[in-house]
């Protein structure tokens, strides 16, 4: 005979669960489906990841997202995790928003990002609900910098980047400062491949770095080079 009262709690059907913290009166729920739509848009050494919530929330409101990163070396095809070498705009686990920016990506590397959706009962199943997106980083190569000439008060510096990338660059930014003086620096912008830094102190070492500026933002910066002006005993202009 049927019981005169309803049961105080019901067993969940297969594939449905109650989380340990769920009250017995709460309906049975299940893990969410994968994020519905994921895009990865590369901008220089950054990637913006955007996704839409799962179509099936599993009947729960407590959805969070985790982002993981894998990098692959194009020459060898070998891959490995890259959490240690990239920077996320916010901690990549337990995200409640549906976007994140990943920066400090390396030029000419292939990246695969995985976004996983989880809710309060995801830990009760072994399967995962995730979507992946891949992106290749095509940031400009760091400029190769040379000292072309120097005098007691000037340094003539030139640089190059591979010809196929030159059309993407609208200007170059040259940053320089006296060695040992980290409080002040000078910046010069130019469209060409060389610059003469004037009004420098004699017999002094300067730190010089060149960075390409592209439509997507900054290209990779060159090495920080140390160039030294001539001492007053040195003769006039000297080509190196």
């Amino acid at each position: 005979l049927p019981s005169p009262e309803g049961a105080t709690s019901c067993e969940c059907e297969e594939g449905f669960f109650r989380a340990p913290q769920d009250p017995a009166s709460m309906p049975c729920t299940r893990p969410p489906s994968a994020p519905h739509y994921l895009t990865a848009v590369g901008m220089g050494a950054k990637v913006e990841l955007r996704w839409t919530p799962p179509q099936d929330s599993g009947g729960r409101e407590d959805i969070v997202y985790s982002v993981t990163c894998e990098q692959c070396w194009p020459e060898s095809g070998e891959c490995g995790p890259c959490e240690a070498s990239v920077r996320y705009s916010e901690p990549p686990h337990g995200l409640t928003r549906t976007s994140v920016t990943v920066s400090d990506l390396e030029p000419h590397m292939n990246y695969t990002f995985t976004v996983e959706a989880r809710n309060g009962v995801s830990g009760l199943v072994t399967s995962r609900s995730f979507r992946t997106a891949s992106v290749s980083i095509n940031q400009t190569e760091p400029p190769k910098v040379r000292l072309e000439g120097r005098s007691t008060t000037s340094l003539s510096v030139s640089w190059s980047i591979p010809p196929p990338q030159q059309s993407r660059v609208w200007k170059y930014e040259v940053t320089y400062r006296k060695k040992g003086d980290s409080n002040s620096y000078n910046v010069r912008r130019t469209e060409g491949f060389s610059v003469t830094l004037d009004d420098l102190a004699p017999d002094t070492t300067y730190l010089v770095q060149v960075q390409a500026l592209t439509q997507e933002g900054q290209g990779a910066g060159s090495k920080v080079h140390e160039f030294q002006t001539l001492s007053p005993e040195g003769s006039g202009n000297l080509a190196v």
Epitope: P142, F227, V240
Partner: antibody, heavy 127, light 108 residues
Amino acid sequence: QVQLQQWGAGLLKPSETLSLTCAVYGGSLSDYHWSWIRQPPGKGLEWIGEINHSGSTNYNPSLKSRVTISVDTSKNQFSLKLSSVSAADTAVYYCAKPFRPHCTNGVCHSGDAFDIWGQGTMATVSS
Amino acid sequence: SYVLTQPPSVSVAPGQTARITCGGNNIGSKNVHWYQQKPGQAPVLVVYDDSDRPSGIPEQFSGSNSGNTATLTISRVEAGDEADYYCQVWDSSSDHLVFGGGTKLTVL
């Protein structure tokens, strides 16, 4: 081919001064910045400081108050003194030569790679 | 002060490729040098200026550096490559030389 030969007292008591010397054979002290580096047992490398032939020095900030590096160009030698030693200063101490001259035609190489190292001197501080 | 971060240990089977990383803020703008050190011996320079090899160092040692990570790659690893490996840079902001903490490479 340049060779580095180093020597100095191996056993010290706390608060004493560690003194080591490094002789450069087969080359001149000029044009290079010469370094001292140490390695405590089972640990990593730590740069102590550097000196050039004219006596200009640059020290690791964590040791600066206790370190003196000097040069004797007539003997082609440079030396390290570390005062007020404690057990934490127990280490193998190395002298080292950078790969390239410090500056050539206006292009300088601070913190260059070290291609030649002394044989190392174990200094133990114990009461 | 500038900090270089290396994994304490890396294990690899003979014949495989080992990758040892050296992390530091904007390390790509610095020249990175790598040393191999075997027990009881002074360090030996294996790669300088990110990717160049001194004479006498075999081709199996190579390096790369960009962004925040420099990498020493040892291809076709053999038992004789088992050692500690250190990265080194010059920090131009403080004018001081910095070593990474070292990575012990174990050949399985």
